[in-house]
């Protein structure tokens, strides 16, 4: 075995060789040492750093039968699928007693066709809208020059002459493909082909044209869609949730939206079956053969109030002398707004009609004029909202009050001396 004085000479009798190859290559580095006594563990260094997870194998062969005899130790480091991170200076390292021995270095290099670190990705873009594509490649050998291609046509006269890592596209009007060639001294590598799909631009100026209690008419201006005509537009409406609040640009409404499709042109749509006096948010997107545009921001809209759709229910009218007691219940039909009150009309056979605003009460006591001998007295009631009166109930005749019939005490309403205004009799 190699010997020196008390500080030993290097035990290495074989040092790592050199490997140079293309990416993906598999190779082995080997070092051999001869030591006296117990064989040490061989460590591998790359650029002076111990490789903790090295794929290495160690073989030990005794050269005699005594424990003090020499051993041959061989360590092999396997490099599978060579990558740039594998390149560098490799050495073997052993600790013998309190001494550290490092072999002569071997070198691992990478040389081959360019390797893509970044390639153009598929994406969608709105028509006539600028965007960027990225491509990055490396050797060795360097330099690596890039050449961009659009629909297989080079965008520069030669590699390295046009845009390099980033390609700025000012806008497209049709779906196109882009790829990138990387050139170095070893040859050419071609990137994946990215498909850039041209979608319609987001519609603009979504607005209300007209409003009804249960329908809204909306219109918008379509965006550019390149060479692809719009096939239809889709409108979504959702009930506004004050708790959530749909902010502009918020991704999705809190509940399932009401979706309607509009043939185009015209870029207008009547949304029906809505609730009256209700806040909604609406948005629109338009579609071509290439796909849909992005949605517009949510636009807050509101249906107006309507009049009640039915008359008050269960009207009863009883008479006791000069007093008449009338009561009713809220209409069962939709109110289509906020109930503001009730109107009551009564009329005798030969007397003019009297019209009264009762407010929100659902009962009234009428003080009839004279001795109460007005004959064939009938009463009608209608509910009203800010939008107006709902339908009047059918005339209800005044029944005579019979003893034993309960008649609660009610606030008396004096019959006005002259009618407030006249209502045409039905």
């Amino acid at each position: 075995a190699p010997r020196g004085t008390q500080a030993e000479e290097s035990p290495f009798v074989g040092n790592p060789g050199n490997i140079t190859g293309a990416r993906g290559l598999t190779g082995t580095l080997r070092c051999q040492l001869q030591v006296q006594g117990e064989p040490p563990e061989v460590h591998w260094l790359r650029d002076g750093q111990i490789l903790e997870l090295a794929d290495s194998t160690q073989t030990q062969v005794p050269l005699g039968e005594d424990e003090q005899d020499d051993w041959i130790v061989v360590s092999q480091l396997r490099i599978t699928s060579l990558q740039l991170s594998d390149t560098g200076q490799y050495q073997c390292l052993v600790f013998l007693g309190h001494q550290t021995f490092v072999s002569q270095p071997g070198y691992v290099g990478l040389e081959g066709l360019p390797y893509f670190l970044e390639e153009p990705e598929d994406r969608t873009v709105a028509a006539n809208t600028p965007f960027n594509l990225s491509c990055q490649a490396q050797g060795p050998p360097e330099p690596v020059d890039l050449l961009w291609l659009q629909d297989a046509v080079p965008l520069a006269t030669a590699p390295g002459h046009g845009p390099q890592r980033s390609l700025h596209v000012p806008g497209l009007n049709k779906t196109s493909s882009f790829s990138c060639e990387a050139h170095n001294a070893k040859g050419v590598t071609t990137s994946r082909t990215a498909t850039i799909t041209v979608l319609p631009q987001q519609p603009r100026n979504l607005h209300l044209v007209s409003r009804q209690p249960t329908e809204l008419e909306v219109a918008w201006t379509p965006g550019l869609s390149g060479i692809y005509p719009l096939t239809h537009c889709t409108l979504q409406a959702v009930l506004s949730d004050d708790g959530m609040g749909i902010q502009a640009g918020e991704p999705d409404p809190p509940e399932e939206p009401l979706t309607s499709q509009a043939s185009v042109p015209p870029h207008q749509l009547r949304l029906g079956s809505l609730h009256p006096h209700t806040p909604y948010h609406i948005r629109v997107a338009c579609t071509s053969s290439q796909g849909p545009s992005s949605w517009t921001h949510w636009l807050p809209v509101e249906t107006p109030e309507g009049v009640p759709l039915g008359p008050p229910e269960n009207i009863s009218a009883t008479r006791n002398g000069s007093q008449a007691f009338v009561h009713w219940q809220e209409p069962r039909a939709p109110l289509q707004g906020t109930l503001l009150g009730y109107r009551l009309a009564y009329q005798g056979q030969d007397t003019p009609e009297v019209l009264m605003d009762i407010g929100l009460r659902q009962e009234v006591t009428l003080e009839l004029q004279g001795d109460g001998s007005v004959s064939n007295l009938t009463v009608c009631v209608a509910a009203y909202t800010a939008a107006g009166d709902g339908p009047w109930s059918l005339p209800v005749p005044l029944e005579a009050w019979r003893p034993g019939q309960a008649q609660p005490v009610h606030q008396l309403v004096k019959e006005p001396s002259t009618p407030a205004f006249s209502w045409p009799w039905w």
Partner: antibody
Framework: QIQLVQSGPELKKPGETVKISCKAS????????MNWVKQAPGKGLKWMGW????????TYADDFKGRFAFSLETSASTAYLQINNLKNEDMGTYFC???????????WGQGTSVTVSS | EIVLTQSPTTMAASPGEKITITCSAS???????LHWYQQKPGFSPKLLIY???NLASGVPARFSGSGSGTSYSLTIGTMEAEDVATYYC????????FGAG
């Protein structure tokens, strides 16, 4: 030529801390471990442990675990011995010594005398 | 740990005399791991013989070492005045230990 030069003598009170340096020259510092050896007054040599200068890993003999710490300043080719909470029995001369294969110690520092007195 | 016992603990010698110091190990050690040091009064120890029988650089040829297993010895073939010192054996087979000198 190879040299190990240690810091000068130290006079300390019980409970204090001392840090002794050992500067190496004339060889590649990280290729040889550094041993520390204690010699009490009038006594023999006692191995305290060593530090692997390549990876910085210390090893302590059983009697020197706890209050004793080996460290390195590789860029300055210097090894250190620190003794915390000094006791009277820590008095003596401390040597650094270069380690070789088969655990021999081929070069020694001149020694650093540590006196502990209240 | 392996205990090393040196004998004699002290000895007087005359110039020209042949001196032998023994070192007995409490359990067997490989001869590769037995070393000898010389320490003169007021000086650091100095490596004298390594791996049982190899002379360290600069050590006169009158020094020699031998042994195996548990029994090792250091011999000064012809004693000289400059050889007055304490001699330590040291083993590195397990936890490092020195003889008492």
């Amino acid at each position: 030529q190879i040299q190990l030069v240690q810091s000068g003598p130290e006079l300390k009170k019980p409970g204090e801390t001392v840090k002794i340096s050992c500067k190496a020259s004339g060889y590649t510092f990280t290729n040889y471990g550094m041993n520390w050896v204690k010699q009490a007054p009038g006594k023999g040599l006692k191995w305290m442990g060593w530090i692997n200068t390549y990876i910085g890993e210390p090893t302590y003999a059983d009697d020197f675990k706890g209050r004793f710490a080996f460290s390195l300043e590789t860029s300055a080719s210097t090894a250190y011995l620190q003794i915390n909470n000094l006791k009277n029995e820590d008095m003596g001369t401390y040597f650094c010594a270069r380690g070789t294969t088969f655990y021999a110690m081929d070069y020694w520092g001149q020694g650093t005398s540590v006196t502990v007195s209240s | 740990e392996i205990v090393l016992t040196q004998s004699p603990t002290t000895m007087a010698a005359s110039p020209g005399e042949k001196i032998t110091i023994t070192c007995s190990a409490s359990s067997s050690i490989s001869s590769n791991y037995l070393h000898w040091y010389q320490q003169k009064p007021g000086f650091s120890p100095k490596l004298l013989i390594y791996r049982t029988s190899n002379l360290a650089s600069g050590v006169p040829a009158r020094f020699s070492g031998s042994g195996s297993g548990t029994s090792y010895s250091l011999t000064i073939g012809t004693m000289e005045a400059e050889d007055v010192a304490t001699y330590y054996c040291q083993q590195g087979s397990s936890i490092l230990t020195f003889g008492a000198g």
